[in-house]
C-alpha cells in the first residue's frame, strides 16, 4: 500500500464531558486486523499500546487532548482527530438566566447569560440533545449568548459551564437547567 494508513476514530464513552470521579472510556477504532494501537495524551509523556483506556474515576490531570494511531506491519496510520476530554465539576456551578425572560415569542430576541463568582473568562452553552458545547466554537468564550430571531427550534433545556483559559479542560459543574419556551 502506498501512502499512510487511514486515520482511526477516537471517542469518549459515554461523553467527553466527564464529571470528576465518574468513569469514562476512551476507544480508538481502526480497521479490522490492526496489529497495534497507540493511544496518547498530548503534552504529556504518557501513552499506552492498547485501543481502549478505561478511566474508572475522572481526575483533573486526565483532562486534556488525546489522539491515537495504529500500526499494521511497519506502517503507522495517520493520527486520529484530537479528542478533547473535559473534567467537569472542578469549580462551583455558574448561574444561567434569560433576558428578558425564559418565555419568548417566535421571531423575538433573547439573551442567555452565564454568570460565575470566579473571575473566569470562558463560558460554554449546552443545549440538551445537541453535540457537546466544544463542537460549537462560535458558542465559546462569552458570558452572553444572544439568540436573534428565535424559532421553535430554540426551545429546550440549556445549561452553561464556566472555565479559565489557563486550564481550558477543567470546567465548572453545569448550571441549573434553564427551560427556554418559544411561544406562538
Amino acid at each position: 500500500q502506498s501512502g499512510p494508513l487511514p486515520k482511526p476514530s477516537l471517542q469518549a464513552l459515554p461523553s467527553s464531558l466527564v464529571p470528576l470521579e465518574k468513569p469514562v472510556t476512551l476507544r480508538c477504532q481502526g480497521p479490522p486486523g490492526v496489529d497495534l494501537y497507540r493511544l496518547e495524551k498530548l503534552s504529556s509523556s504518557r501513552y499506552q499500546d492498547q485501543a481502549v483506556l478505561f478511566i474508572p474515576a475522572m481526575k483533573r490531570s486526565l483532562a486534556g487532548r488525546y489522539r491515537c494511531s495504529y500500526q499494521n506491519g511497519s506502517l503507522w496510520s495517520l493520527p486520529s482527530d484530537q479528542l478533547e476530554l473535559v473534567a467537569t465539576g472542578v469549580f462551583a456551578k455558574p448561574s444561567l438566566s434569560a433576558q428578558p425572560g425564559p418565555a419568548v415569542s417566535s421571531g423575538g430576541d433573547v439573551t442567555l447569560q452565564c454568570q460565575t463568582r470566579y473571575g473566569f473568562d470562558q463560558f460554554a452553552l449546552y443545549k440538551e440533545g445537541d453535540p457537546a458545547p466544544y463542537k460549537n466554537p462560535e458558542r465559546w468564550y462569552r458570558a452572553s449568548f444572544p439568540i436573534i430571531t428565535v424559532t421553535a427550534a430554540h426551545s429546550g433545556t440549556y445549561r452553561c459551564y464556566s472555565f479559565s483559559s489557563r486550564d481550558p479542560y477543567l470546567w465548572s459543574a453545569p448550571s441549573d437547567p434553564l427551560e427556554l419556551v418559544v411561544t406562538g
Epitope: 503534552s43 474508572p56 474515576a57 481526575k59 483533573r60 472555565f163 479559565s164 489557563r166 486550564d167
Partner: antibody
C-alpha cells in the same frame, strides 16, 4: 534532564509561617500538574497539595486546608507552598513532585521543623 | 522510618515479591516507588504495571485491591524502601517495605 529543586525550609515556631519554593527545569513546566508531598519518620509519605498546569485549580489534604496555599508561576517555572499557622505535626521533609496522581519526578526535599 | 513499615531480607539473585493491598477496589490506579536512604522516592511503575524506564527485572501486577511488585533477580543496588500508592480515591501511600540483603 528533569530537575526539581526545593528551597525555603527551616526551623520555625508553632503558629508561624514559612514559604517553600521549587524551581523546575528540563521540561515544559506549564504542561504539568505539580504537587507537594511530605515525609515524616512517624507518618510516612503524605500527599499535601496539587495544582493544575495553568494554576486555575488547586486542592489540599484536609489537615492543611485553610493553612497551606499552593501556587505556581509558569513564567518562572516555579512552584510554591505557603504554610501558615504551622503545627508540630507539619514537621517533615517536603518534596516538590511532578504530577497529580502518580509522581514521576521528585526534588531532593527540604526539611521543615516546627518546634518551640 | 515509618514504624508501620515492614522489613524483608533477601539474597542477591533472589526473586522478591512485595505485596500491597488497598482498602477498596482501586482498579489499576496504583503506583510503586523506590526510595534509597537519603534520597527522594523514584517512580518505578504506574497504573499497576506500566514501566517508567526502569530495569526490566522490576514488574508489577494486580488489579482491584491486591497488587504485587516483583524483582525477578535481586541486585545489591535494589536495597531500598518500596512504597505503593493508590490514587483512585484521594491519594495515599502505603507504609512501605524496607528491603535488605541477607
Amino acid at each position: 534532564e528533569v530537575k526539581l529543586q526545593e528551597s525555603g525550609g527551616g526551623l520555625v515556631q508553632p503558629g508561624r509561617s514559612l514559604k517553600l519554593s521549587c524551581t523546575a527545569s528540563g521540561f515544559t513546566f506549564s504542561d504539568y500538574f505539580m504537587s507537594w508531598v511530605r515525609q515524616a519518620p512517624t507518618r510516612g509519605l503524605e500527599w499535601v497539595a496539587s495544582i493544575s498546569s495553568g494554576g486555575a485549580s488547586a486542592y489540599w489534604r484536609d489537615s492543611v486546608k485553610g493553612r497551606f496555599t499552593i501556587s505556581r508561576d509558569n513564567a518562572k517555572s516555579a512552584l510554591y507552598l505557603q504554610m501558615d499557622s504551622l503545627r508540630s505535626e507539619d514537621t517533615a521533609t517536603y518534596f516538590c513532585a511532578r504530577g497529580e496522581l502518580d509522581f514521576d519526578y521528585w526534588g531532593q526535599g527540604v526539611m521543615v521543623a516546627v518546634s518551640s | 522510618a515509618d514504624p508501620n513499615s515492614t522489613l524483608l531480607s533477601a539474597s542477591v539473585g533472589d526473586r522478591v515479591t512485595l505485596n500491597c493491598t488497598a482498602s477498596q477496589n482501586v482498579y489499576k490506579n496504583l503506583a510503586w516507588y523506590q526510595q534509597k536512604l537519603g534520597e527522594a522516592p523514584r517512580l518505578l511503575l504506574y497504573s499497576a504495571n506500566s514501566q517508567t524506564g526502569i530495569p526490566s527485572r522490576f514488574s508489577g501486577s494486580g488489579s482491584g485491591p491486591d497488587f504485587t511488585l516483583t524483582i525477578s533477580s535481586l541486585q545489591p543496588e535494589d536495597v531500598a524502601s518500596y512504597f505503593c500508592q493508590q490514587y483512585y480515591s484521594g491519594n495515599t501511600f502505603g507504609a512501605g517495605t524496607k528491603l535488605e540483603l541477607k
